[in-house]
Amino acid sequence: NECPKLQPPVYGKIEPSQAVYSFKDQVLVSCDTGYKVLKDNGVMDTFQIECLKDGAWSNKIPTCKIVDCGAPAGLKHGLVTFSTRNNLTTYKSEIRYSCQQPYYKMLHNTTGVYTCSAHGTWTNEVLKRSLPTCLPVCGQPSRALPNLVKRIIGGRNAELGLFPWQALIVVEDTSRVPNDKWFGSGALLSESWILTAAHVLRSQRRDNTVIPVSKEHVTVYLGLHDVRDKSGAVNSSAARVILHPDFNIQNYNHDIALVQLQKPVPLGAHVMPICLPRPEPEGPAPHMLGLVAGWGISNPNVTVDEIILSGTRTLSDVLQYVKLPVVSHAECKASYESRSGNYSVTENMFCAGYYEGGKDTCLGDSGGAFVIFDEMSQHWVAQGLVSWGGPEECGSKQVYGVYTKVSNYVDWLWEEMNSPRAVRDLQVER
């Protein structure tokens, strides 16, 4: 017996196509690219039917349904917009992922355009099915930092958002009797990492050993402008405290450390990371001007409680900044060798300041970043960390401030931040 002539489904075809179908003949129903066979609420690539002995087909011809990629996945620190009207998610529809500008930017600079493929997946030319990654934008404050042509020697009040990477690190070491409390500065490197000087995070309880303070004793404040008003600041506890393994307390060689924050901090106008330099041993060139910010909390008689809780006046309640020129290694070395004492300015350090002195150099709290504008990338880069000063401390004539040369440690920093020991797998832009 012959079976009735078959009509192929819309957006589909029947194979083989014959004038007559007899008992035991089989046909395969398939759909055009971007469509799938829909039968009994089931979706399949092809569907086979057979001409039965009684002249009827074993099943009805199924329909061809357009492939639907479904709602696109959300993007961390990004958003998705539909290029097609009515927010269509079907075959050949387009969407565009973008990052939360200006705080995040897309890794690999991809277009972020994804098309709904015939396979039912959102696909990008470069990344294929993988989602783009939004990385924090570093070294680009929402407010432009002052141009570096003028020599501003004295400390200035920083406007909110000028130094969005600036962190206040508060340490309360309860292993001491009474509890020991102190401050330092740091610089945000990513949503979860703070760069600082090792001596800020070293417990002074034991002298000839470098013992980091317990992570439980560390609090980091970000987006802080005035220590009397912490309402707008983000405070975070530490997940890990990592001192450079070769930190030397005798001469402060390798004075660099990292704090991993317990939770990633949300970035915004007042909280943004600083860029790391390229790994090169030269460090910043002499006469280059850099900026250092700090609250100038250098009065040992002021306790943490007074500042953090009641906001008692310190050297400065409001974040200050100062502009300083890099000094040649030879000049700095000579200035320290001419003084009594075994001060060693190593290759892991550089100096900055003015020959004529000026207490402005005090404004950079220990661990704060000495930042220089990189003309090539148009980003601010952390070239140094406030480390130490001579016996006269800051501001004396021909006693330069000594900074950790960050470019010597870039590989170590990346290694630590991306090590399996890191609490989370965190990506930061290199």
């Epitope: 001491r176 020991d180 409390k181 034991r206 002298d207 130490w388």
Partner: antibody, heavy 116, light 112 residues
């Protein structure tokens, strides 16, 4: 080259205040704490306590809580011991020494005499 | 407070002969960090004390190797293999493990 230089001898009357200085040189002052030690004439050494030179937080032994105060002038790399309301039993030599637990370099000592 | 007991109070030694000083603490000086904070100091007549040994057995730079420190827990010893004239003075042991830190009463080394 590491040195701790203390201020000179003091002669005081009971009830007065004395402030002894200890100037450090040859190392980064804020790297090490400063410990204060008392030595009565012909007697042994007594640990009075120490001050963290980075945080400025002092720690006192029980016998030295109250009238005794440790302080710092970080910019001058100097630590101070102040004794208020002096008593005759405060007549002794006071030493400053580097570190909280190092005690590796010592000042020359400052002799305080309390006499009416 | 930890009591540090030194013995003997006085030690008379002939130059070139060995000497040994004992220091006992009322509690173990092993710290939670695995280190034992026990130092030996020498105070020569009319001078400030000078550290000779730290962490039980580590010799300070410039200290002659005739000095050796040993011990653990609560019992510690300072030995001088051959006493020299410059060694006379009062020797103190000191513990920096338990707060408040404490000195021993001192041992006076005399030359016979």
């Amino acid at each position: 080259q590491i040195q701790l230089v203390q201020s000179g001898p003091e002669l005081k009357t009971p009830g007065e205040t004395v402030k002894i200085s200890c100037k450090a040189s040859g190392y980064i002052f804020t790297s090490y704490g400063i410990t204060w030690v008392k030595q009565a004439p012909g007697k042994g050494l007594k640990w009075m306590g120490w001050i963290n030179t980075y945080s400025g937080v002092p720690t006192y032994a029980d016998d030295f809580k109250g009238r005794f105060a440790f302080s710092l002038e970080t910019s001058a790399s100097t630590a101070y011991l102040q004794i208020n309301n002096l008593k005759n039993e405060d007549t002794t030599t006071y030493f400053c020494t580097r570190g909280g637990d190092a005690l590796d370099y010592w000042g020359q000592g400052t002799s305080v005499t309390v006499s009416s | 407070d930890i009591v540090m007991t030194q013995a003997p109070l006085t030690l008379s030694v002939t130059i070139g002969q060995p000497a040994s000083i004992s220091c006992k603490s009322s509690q173990s000086l092993l710290d939670s960090d695995g280190k034992t904070y026990l130092s030996w100091l020498l105070q020569r007549p009319g001078q400030s004390p000078k550290r000779l040994i730290y962490l039980v057995s580590k010799l300070d730079s410039g200290v002659p190797d005739r000095f050796t420190g040993s011990g653990s827990g609560t019992d510690f010893t300072l030995k001088i293999s051959r006493v020299e004239a410059e060694d006379l003075g009062v020797y103190y042991c000191w513990q920096g493990t338990h707060f408040p830190y404490t000195f021993g009463g001192g041992t006076k080394l005399e030359i016979k």
